[in-house]
């Protein structure tokens, strides 16, 4: 990734270096070290201070974005003297060339699309590349299928999400023969970007006095269990006047998803459809296909 690393240091340098692939900041170990500290300051003056690695000459930043530019700083005391060094990590390249409007969503439980737009000042020959690293940083995923607009990559389709974890780091690099292109990076939670399918296996069974609706929770990319779901049922009487209120019923997820409601014979024609959401986010899925029950002459 193209980025100028500029060191601001006193005469005897710690030789601070940063590897953006591993997010590891390291420096030359000093003999008889009594104190070490590393941190970064971002453009909004927020400070992030990770734990030092066991050897105390490096530290790893877990959840940080770098595209706005950051300054790393290392403080080391030895029994003889103190060291201090700053490392500027700017997002080099022409302002406004980075990918923008970046977003991703997971759908159908195991597919993901990411899209972005070319930067407003990016040259015509700009090309963007997407890399994804999971929170454990054990592997990097390169985009396997790019979505293109006039030859420029403006999106990515992934059909294998096995390398992702619950939180992932997305990096869009850019190249051009004309000028330096800035990068864009983002941290995304899979639970916040997943769009659920509607519930499946929706059935309605009625007796003389009640109707019982049953359904199965949707298959999801996240490992969710039954308590993580909230459902909404839309029970709708057919052939009613326009503007008549639909009955929307909220139901918490259960091991056996069911909703029993009074409906006596003869019963008019009704339809029921169901949608699902994560109970904590309420990002509703689309509605399931409507199931009809009852009769026209009810």
């Amino acid at each position: 990734e193209k980025s100028d690393l500029r060191t601001v240091a006193p005469a005897s340098s710690l030789n601070v270096r940063f590897d953006s692939r591993t997010m590891n900041l390291s420096w030359d170990c000093q003999e008889n070290t009594t104190f070490s500290k590393c941190f970064l300051t971002d453009k909004k003056n927020r400070v992030v201070e990770p734990r030092l690695s066991n050897n105390e000459c490096s530290c790893t930043f877990r959840e940080i974005c770098l595209h706005e530019g950051v300054t790393f700083e290392v403080h080391v005391n030895t029994s003889q003297r103190g060291f201090q060094q700053k490392l500027l990590y700017p997002n080099s390249g022409r302002e406004g060339t980075a990918a923008q409007n970046f977003s991703c969503f997971i759908y159908n439980a195991d597919l993901m699309n990411c899209t972005w737009a070319r930067g407003p000042t990016a040259p015509r020959d700009v090309q963007y590349f997407l890399y994804i690293r999971n929170s454990k940083r054990r592997r990097e995923i390169r985009c396997p299928y790019y979505i293109q607009d006039s030859g420029t990559h403006v999106g990515c389709h992934l059909d294998n999400l096995s390398g992702l974890t619950s939180r992932n780091y997305f990096l869009v690099n850019g190249t051009s023969r004309e000028i330096g292109i800035q990068f864009f990076d983002s941290l995304l939670d899979t639970k916040k970007i997943e769009r659920f399918n509607p519930p499946s296996n929706v059935t309605v069974r009625c007796n003389t006095t009640h109707c019982l609706v049953r359904w199965k929770q949707p298959r999801t990319y996240q490992k969710l269990s039954y308590l993580d779901f909230q459902y909404q049922l839309d029970v709708h009487r057919k052939n009613t006047q326009p503007g008549t209120e639909n009955l929307l019923i909220n139901v918490s997820g259960d091991l056996e998803n069911r909703y029993n409601f009074p409906s006596s014979e003869p019963r008019a024609k009704h339809s029921v459809k169901i949608r699902a959401a994560d109970v904590r986010i309420l990002n509703w899925s689309s509605w399931s296909e409507a199931i009809e029950f009852g009769s026209d002459d009810g």
Partner: antibody, heavy 120, light 110 residues
Framework: QVQLVQSGAEVKKPGASVKVSCKVS????????IHWVRQAPGKGLEWMGG????????VYAQRFQGRVTMTEDTSTDTAYMELSSLRSEDTAVYYC?????????????WGQGTMVTVSS | QSVLTQPPSVSGAPGQRVTISCTGS?????????VSWYQQLPGTAPKLLIY??NKRPSGVDRFSGSKSGTSASLAITGLQAEDEADYYC???????????FGGGTKLTVL
């Protein structure tokens, strides 16, 4: 109606092993995740282990590591917990439970418990 | 010694409202991880009462949960004799798998 039915009480000698079973009815085991929790007499609840989807494997509480093995027989919808090198402090009621949520771990439905007594 | 601290006992008269506290730290409740609550009637298995801090499973009423900072609490309204039981809070400890439970609170209905 989903139910978890555990095996009967056991009395074991120190150093021996015990294997507790947990049969699921009204659901298939492959659609569920089972965890195990124990409770010593007059004491609180202690998580032992179970399936972690993030790791995609069964994970164990550190203090039981190397002594406990959790397995599943999907053909009979039965989960098992085996604890070896038993000592008197392992005397407890052992519960299996169905995970209702993974984040954080929430146990939605519990078995009736199996009393394991370790005594010489 | 549990990382979640609960009062050993609380009591209340029938019809009253009682609350049970659960105090953690920045590495569990304050991390922030959601809290769940379990009821254990004498001689029976625990039963889930509250999950995701304040959600109730179907069939549970009169019980409500809340969370603020590094603490959570369980409130029981309209206390009844059958509420006499042990109550446990639970959450996750950062860096550890599984669940951590509070030490439990014995509720006595006077």
């Amino acid at each position: 109606q989903v139910q978890l039915v555990q095996s009967g009480a056991e009395v074991k000698k120190p150093g021996a092993s015990v294997k507790v079973s947990c049969k699921v009815s009204g659901y298939t085991l492959t659609e569920l995740s089972i965890h195990w929790v124990r409770q010593a007499p007059g004491k609180g609840l202690e998580w032992m282990g179970g399936f972690d989807p993030e790791e995609n494997e069964i994970v164990y509480a550190q203090r039981f590591q190397g002594r406990v093995t959790m397995t599943e027989d999907t053909s009979t919808d039965t989960a098992y917990m085996e604890l070896s090198s038993l000592r008197s402090e392992d005397t407890a009621v052992y519960y299996c439970a169905i995970v209702g949520s993974f984040s954080p771990l929430t146990l939605g439905l519990w078995g009736q418990g199996t009393m394991v007594t370790v005594s010489s | 010694q549990s990382v979640l601290t609960q009062p050993p006992s609380v009591s209340g008269a029938p019809g009253q409202r009682v609350t049970i506290s659960c105090t953690g730290s920045g590495s569990n409740i304050g991390a922030p991880y959601d809290v769940s609550w379990y009821q254990q009637l004498p001689g029976t298995a625990p039963k889930l009462l509250i999950y995701h801090n304040n959600k109730r499973p179907s069939g549970v009423d009169r019980f409500s949960g809340s969370k603020s900072g590094t603490s959570a609490s369980l409130a029981i309204t309209g206390l009844q004799a059958e509420d006499e039981a042990d109550y446990y809070c639970a959450t996750v400890e950062a860096g550890l798998s599984g669940s951590v439970f509070g030490g439990g609170t014995k509720l006595t209905v006077l």
